[in-house]
């Protein structure tokens, strides 16, 4: 029961996390104009990984994509790559984990196979979360560096007569979404890895013994008749055929997924 709950919760947490990573990657507010030195600006600038936007005094927002690939900063390209890798790994992890869920029966899939799949998806979620956290952190570091650089030469102008306030950028909402989402994906991955340990078949003390019959050379292994014997890896007396019967673990109702806001 605890294993199913841990695995199910890990899946849901990872699902929310990956949805958050996708949302963060698509968001335009990775960096937003710092209004501390210009709180009365009628033109508000903000930037994402894919385009930059300007909200004007009419309330109209104009966004323009970065139509160049080679002209973009290497750091921005790196952040894009990290986020995309995070999404791809997370998506594959989700796909794998769906089939690994204990509450879902697929043919005659062994618990050992489900355990391996759970571990694989868990590792994928962990790497996905780390990619997202790394991507967001690299971008945040880039912002901090640029912020203090622009603060150093904040005001430029002709003889100090006419002041031009240089636009400074600070953390946008997408960074916080990315950090939280990356963290959730990471936590979900860890939970999947923990669930994997509970899913892994318990080791038996019985060793396989070979019986040599005259004229035949057939090896009999205890636990071969899994539907009726108590031997081998089938220590929980589960029916291997899927006839609609469910064990105690599987009868439990699965908590519904709530919308993440």
């Amino acid at each position: 029961m605890a294993v199913t709950a841990c695995q199910g919760l890990g899946f849901v947490v990872s699902l929310i996390g990956i949805a958050g990573i996708i949302a963060a990657t698509c968001m335009d507010q990775w960096s937003t104009q710092d209004l501390y030195n210009n709180p009365v600006t009628a033109v508000f600038n903000y930037q994402g990984l894919w385009r930059s936007c300007v909200r004007e005094s009419s309330g109209f927002t104009e966004c323009r994509g970065y139509f160049t690939l080679l002209g973009l900063p290497a750091m921005l390209q790196a952040v894009r790559a990290l986020m995309i890798v995070g999404i791809v790994l997370g998506a594959i992890g989700l796909l794998v984990s769906i089939f690994a869920l204990k509450c879902i029966r697929i043919g005659s899939m062994e618990d050992s196979a489900k355990a391996n799949m759970t571990l694989t998806s868990g590792i994928m979620f962990i790497v996905s979360g780390l990619c997202a956290i790394a991507g967001v952190s690299v971008f945040a570091n880039m912002l901090v560096t640029n912020f203090w650089m622009s603060t150093a030469n904040m005001y430029t102008g002709m003889g100090g007569m006419v002041q031009t306030v240089q636009t400074r950028y600070t953390f946008g909402a997408a960074l916080f979404v990315g950090w939280v989402a990356g963290g959730l994906t990471l936590i979900g991955g860890v939970m999947m890895c923990i669930a994997c340990r509970g899913l892994a078949p318990e080791e038996t003390n019985y060793k396989a013994v070979s019986y040599h019959a005259s004229g035949h050379s057939v090896a009999y292994k205890p636990g071969g008749f899994k539907a009726s014997t108590g031997f081998g890896s089938n220590t929980k007396n589960k029916k291997i055929y899927d006839g609609g019967a469910r064990t105690e673990d599987e009868v439990q109702s699965y908590p519904s997924k709530h919308d993440y806001v």
């Epitope: 009365v40 009628a42 300007v54 004007e56 005094s57 009419s58 309330g59 323009r64 006419v162």
Partner: antibody, heavy 115, light 113 residues
Amino acid sequence: QVQLVQSGAEVKKPGASVKVSCKASGYSFTTYWMHWVRQAPGQGLEWMGLIDPSDSETRLNQKFKDRVTMTVDTSTSTVYMELSSLRSEDTAVYYCASNRWLLGWGQGTLVTVSS
Amino acid sequence: DIVMTQSPDSLAVSLGERATINCKSSQSLLNSGNQKNYLTWYQQKPGQPPKLLIYWASTRESGVPDRFSGSGSGTDFTLTISSLQAEDVAVYYCQNDYSYPLTFGQGTKLEIK
């Protein structure tokens, strides 16, 4: 096309309040902020403030912040501007303006403050 | 507040001649986010509301005759009417669209000589 229709002329006594309405049509009402600009007789244009019809958030010129109240009724696509504690120098034509670059302007509402 | 100063206050030009109106702002109106100058030009005829002519300092609004052109960047801007027509007689205003409160120049009255 953008159309902004304002309420009729008003004559008020000093100290009173006036509420001017501006009904919008021909564009997405909540997409653009509504600005209010006034023009005293023979004078230039003076920006009073704006309201975001989507959430009723306002941004006012400090000069008017204690006397101006802007409200919105999205059901009728109408914005209201109320100016209180009227003085003789508030005699002016009041315009509402919206859309990008204040492309659309109302016909103006003449408010006369006289004792 | 950004102060907008127009010159001259009034201008008399012969029909078919070039008219030039200047506008100076106390602060730069250049937005580094998109490299646009947030200066707008309006034309106002007697008894009418202002009419948008030019935005982003040099972009002509659709329907505005191409004899109207805007130029300048930062703090210094110019509105030019290449060949004055009778219907161009009006008061012209420049407006800071970059910082609150949005401010207008005092206006330039254009007349026919």
